[in-house]
């Protein structure tokens, strides 16, 4: 029974493997891996891909087996599969393996990225979409705006990202986001880098205002120079010969 022989495709259908309380947990949490067969089984095996011998066995005459991982460490994270068998299948014959379950044991999730779609410059009346992208599916994403203590928006997403829509008129500002596991025990990511959203016309009007100031100053300088030249010319006509300013 130690070495499962690979049965022909579809011969004994695969079981399903799930984790309680979650597939992403902090170190020290007790995790239960539940293997559920599509029929009553006799023995269940928990496997780590690439290893021939099962990590754990459970002999239960039922369709469900639970494997207990106590106070998990980051080293216990990784890929798991389970198989089941029945005594009437013959020695060493196991079911097809379950789909891989990825168990992640970490204090903190990787930092997400925050980008603006289509870009960080907003036209008048146009909406902008902010995409907070992590690395894990089925997470809850939170968007923050600088200067506002409470989260601006929440999104639960089956994808490893979430899109937040900002209305054009209120869009300009500085934003950041993070994501976390959807249920306790919560594991949080680091905050993303900040993203600045600005008006499309606010930048150009700043340039115009600046240019007007520069033009005004240039005009004043020219008028001043002109006055000085006129004054100098008149002064030369009255001055004694040989004397130059």
């Amino acid at each position: 029974d130690i070495t499962p022989s690979v049965p022909p495709a579809s011969y004994h259908p695969k079981p399903w493997l799930g984790a309680q309380p979650a597939t992403v947990v902090t170190p020290g949490v007790n995790v239960t891996l539940r293997c559920r067969a599509p029929q009553p089984a006799w023995r269940f095996g928990l496997f780590k891909p690439g290893e021939i011998a099962p990590l754990l066995f459970r002999d239960v005459s039922s369709e469900l087996a639970e494997f207990f991982l106590e106070e998990v460490t980051p080293a216990q994270g990784g890929s798991y599969r389970c198989c089941y068998r029945r005594p009437d299948w013959g020695p060493g014959v196991w079911s097809q393996p379950s789909d891989v379950l990825e168990l992640l044991v970490t204090e903190e999730l990787p930092r997400p990225s925050l980008v603006a779609l289509p870009g960080p410059v907003v036209g008048p009346g146009a909406n902008v979409s902010l995409r907070c992208a992590g690395r894990l599916r089925n997470m809850s994403f939170v968007l923050y705006r600088e200067g506002v203590a409470a989260p601006l928006q929440y999104r639960h997403s089956a994808q490893p990202w979430a899109d937040f829509t900002l209305l054009g008129a209120r869009a300009p500002g500085t934003y950041s986001c993070y994501y976390h596991t959807p249920s306790a025990p919560y594991v949080l990511s680091q905050r993303s880098e900040v993203l600045v959203i600005s008006w499309e016309d606010s930048g150009s009007s700043d340039y115009t205002r600046g240019n007007l100031v520069r033009l005004g100053l240039a005009g004043l300088v020219l008028i001043s120079l002109g006055a000085l030249v006129t004054f100098d010319w008149r002064s030369q006509n009255r001055a004694p010969a040989g004397i130059r300013p």
Epitope: P8, S10, Y11, H12, P13, W16, L17, G18, R36, P38, Q39, P40, S61, S62, E63, L64
Partner: antibody, heavy 121, light 106 residues
């Protein structure tokens, strides 16, 4: 949508055999067990057996071994149950039902409409 | 084989009344499933995996239990709930059903 369409009512003589059919549609036939359930008039439900169409593997209630034979034809997505050596005790409505076969659900999630079988001389 | 005993076999309830029916297993099972059947119709999946209500069915129904003791509860009886309810286990071969609880409206 998932559907299990069973063959029509049968009238058979004692000692004869009959073959009931259950045509599946709306899902991948080879992914789920098909079960057969017996219900005599005014009585409860009795599980006969199940077949996994992907492999043809069958599991029977000991009580029905030798009485019922389960088969499946993948090309037509149809499951069959043959009942042999019929007696009046076999008069009943026979249902086919699909096993949900999901991590979060393990009941019989879809049922056929039933085939009434009457055994009479 | 696992014997499932349902009680009561027959019961009646007035509209708005709370209804509780039980299913006792001769050995421990992982999950209990419940079906509703009306005369001349196929059984309908009603509650699966002990406590999950099948989609499209009224929230006044709930299921609970573990091990060998399970129950189906209707918080407020309605006329359309009159039917026979069967419990069912798939934890051990042969799969078995309870004898049914026939629920009538007063």
């Amino acid at each position: 949508q998932v559907q299990l369409q069973q063959s029509g009512a049968e009238l058979a003589r004692p000692g004869a055999s009959v073959k009931l059919s259950c045509k599946a549609s709306g899902y991948t036939f080879t992914d789920n067990y098909i079960n057969w359930v017996k219900q005599r008039t005014g009585q409860g439900l009795e599980w006969i057996g199940e077949i996994y169409p992907g492999s043809g593997n069958t599991y029977y209630n000991e009580k029905f071994k030798g009485k019922a034979t389960l088969t499946a034809d993948k090309s037509s997505s149809t499951a069959y149950m043959q009942l042999s050596s019929l007696t009046s005790e076999d008069s009943a409505v026979y249902f086919c039902a699909r096993s949900a076969n999901r991590y979060d659900r393990g009941d019989f999630d879809y049922w056929g409409q039933g085939t009434p079988l009457t055994v009479s001389s | 084989q696992i014997l499932l005993t349902q009680s009561p076999a027959i019961m009646s309830a007035s509209p708005g009344e709370k209804v509780t029916m039980t299913c006792s297993a001769s050995s421990s099972v992982s999950y209990m499933h419940w079906y509703q059947q009306k005369p001349g119709s196929s059984p309908k999946p009603w509650i699966y995996d002990t406590s999950n209500l099948a989609s499209g069915f009224p929230a006044r129904f709930s299921g609970s239990g573990s091990g060998t003791s399970y129950s189906l509860i209707i918080s407020s009886m309605e006329a359309e709930d009159a039917a026979t309810y069967y419990c069912h286990q798939r934890s051990s071969y042969p799969y078995t059903f309870g004898g049914g609880t026939k629920l009538e409206i007063k």
